[in-house]
């Protein structure tokens, strides 16, 4: 806290420019309107005021908006977003991309705040939706925001922000995020023709159920390992030596290489070594040939 | 990386003026404050002033304010500081720096430094 | 003006001692103080800002100390190339000022 001292003879601040840099915090204090500052505040960002002077600066805003910043003021933060805490966000009605843009900005290059947190969280709810122009900014400004999200909060975003989404931007995405997610990516690529479908697809394909990997593996594909080893066990599993054979395409030797890895090896366990045997890799751990395979789970199905 | 290029060293006369200048290049030029340190042997750092290269915006030390000049040509990306009326006391190694976050003014990067040397 | 005095123009050691360079600001600065080593012919390089963060690449037996008006930096286990010029730099308000330097020289 600065402690209330008066503006000596001839400082008082007229408007917001650089000789204030030179200002000591109690002359700040005493010298600066808070009114002038908060019309002026375009030109703040301007001047290379130093952290302990920014404390200054936020101490007369706070001052002068108790409820929270207006949008006219927020938008021209610039590096004094810095010295807001969580609680001075929540206050705050941010409903401009531009603002948004704006804050991100200052703080980009560094790990995602509490601060900017908070802002994002803001923002969003005041929109009710993650539109494809939000998905757009946040996910250039933070790669891996989607994988933040719980699958709740990601279940308001449109298929058509999918559109948006980079292959990088979902690689801390946990299975039930891409269950979320790929229902809504199955729908936005939906009138893609095949080949760029599969590009389009690939990333989301952590979230695919069964029927569209069989889907899949009819149309040439040639799925590679590394998309293939995300896929969901139980999605994988019921697939056929074929279809998997057809899912990869040239790819199919790399199955070797990971055996002992789910899903592979829970696949292996399920097929017959005979059909295995058909691959030519040496794949072992399949069901050997004159075993009767009961699938208990359908005859539960039928009691 | 950043580099920012200085020449090793100038000689001047009394009374004559002197245009020392400073090359940026590994970052982009226009974003960051360029600011300008002089040391004398045996003696401290003085911070002089800082240009900001998009905006032309100057910023001196009062002490400096009629002995230095800070200009930017944004196509070469170079920053000049031009002495004037120089005298022995202006006989110094000159310093550019950048700041990369202005909220906090500590000298990320330091050109190598221009000796000058002022004598008759 | 802020005024940062470094009060030991020298200080002598020996390469695997223990030495701390000591800076005192006229007014309360915070944390915001930077310390620059320099060498024989080369520019100041950042060694540690908001007086204990060490900048990148910076070997952890530099470490810097203290708030308000007292700073001080200490090298533990000193290597011979360790021995220069140490600044240090009030970032609390402008105009940015340093103190005159201590020189770390051999016994």
């Known amino acids: 806290e600065v402690e209330k001292t008066a503006c000596p003879s001839g400082k008082k601040a007229r408007e917001i420019d650089e000789s204030l840099i030179f200002y000591k915090k109690w002359e700040l204090e005493a010298c600066v309107d808070a009114a002038l500052l908060a019309t002026q505040m375009d030109r703040v960002n301007a001047i290379p005021f130093t952290y302990e002077q920014l404390d200054v600066l936020k101490h007369k805003l706070d001052e002068l908006y108790p409820q929270g910043y207006p949008e006219s003021v927020i938008q021209h933060l610039g590096y004094l977003f810095l010295k807001m805490s969580p609680e001075d966000i929540r206050k705050w009605n941010v409903t401009s991309l531009e603002t948004l843009k704006a804050l991100l900005e200052v703080n980009k290059g560094h790990e995602m705040s509490p601060q900017v947190a908070t802002l994002i969280d803001r923002f969003v709810k005041g929109r009710g939706q993650l539109d494809k122009d939000t998905l757009d900014t946040l996910t250039a400004f933070y790669p891996g925001y989607l994988c933040s999200l719980s699958p709740e909060e990601l279940s308001s975003v449109p298929p058509s922000s999918i559109w948006a989404v980079r292959p990088q931007d979902l690689d801390t995405c946990d299975p039930r995020q891409l269950d979320v997610l790929y229902p809504k990516a199955r729908l936005a690529f939906q009138n893609m023709n095949g080949s760029e479908y599969f590009v389009k697809i690939q990333s989301f394909l952590g979230g695919a159920p069964t029927e569209d990997l069989k889907a899949l593996s009819q149309q040439n594909v040639s799925m590679d390992l590394a998309t293939f080893m995300k896929l969901r066990t139980d999605a994988v599993l019921p697939l056929t030596v074929a279809e998997v054979q057809k899912l990869l395409g040239p790819h199919v030797e790399g199955l070797k290489a990971e055996e002992r890895h789910r899903p592979v090896r829970d696949w292996i366990l399920r097929q017959r070594q005979d059909d295995l045997d058909t691959l030519g890799l040496g794949l072992q751990g399949g069901i050997p040939n004159g075993y009767l395979v009961l699938d208990l789970s359908m005859q539960e199905a039928l009691s | 990386q950043v580099q920012l290029q200085q020449p090793g060293a100038e000689l001047v006369k009394p009374g004559a003026s002197m245009k020392l200048s400073c090359k940026a290049s590994g970052y982009t030029f226009t974003s960051y404050w360029m600011h300008w340190v002089k040391q004398r042997p045996g003696q401290g750092l003085e911070w002089i002033g800082m240009?900001?290269?998009?905006?032309?915006?100057?910023i001196y030390y009062e002490k400096f304010k009629s002995k230095a000049t800070l200009t930017v040509d944004k196509s070469s990306s170079t920053a000049y500081m031009q002495l004037s009326s120089l005298t022995s006391e202006d006989s110094a190694v000159y310093y550019c720096a950048i700041i990369i976050t202005p909220v906090v003014p500590k000298f990320d990067y330091w050109g190598q430094g221009t000796t000058l040397t002022v004598s008759s | 003006d802020i005024v940062m005095t470094q009060s030991h123009q020298f200080m002598s050691t020996s390469v695997g001692d223990r030495v701390s360079v000591t800076c005192k600001a006229s007014?309360?600065?915070?944390?915001?103080v930077a310390w620059y080593q320099q060498k024989p012919g080369q520019s100041p390089k950042l060694l540690i800002y908001w007086a204990s963060t060490r900048h990148t690449g910076v070997p952890d037996r530099f470490t810097g100390s203290g708030s308000g008006t007292d700073f001080t930096l200490t090298i533990s286990n000193v290597q011979s190339e360790d021995l220069a010029d140490y600044f240090c730099?009030?970032?609390?308000?402008?105009?940015?000022?340093f103190g005159a330097g201590t020189k770390l020289e051999l016994k």
């Open positions: 007014h309360d600065v915070g944390t915001s």
């Open positions: 730099q009030q970032y609390s308000s402008y105009p940015l000022t």
């Open positions: 240009i900001h290269p998009n905006s032309d915006n100057t």
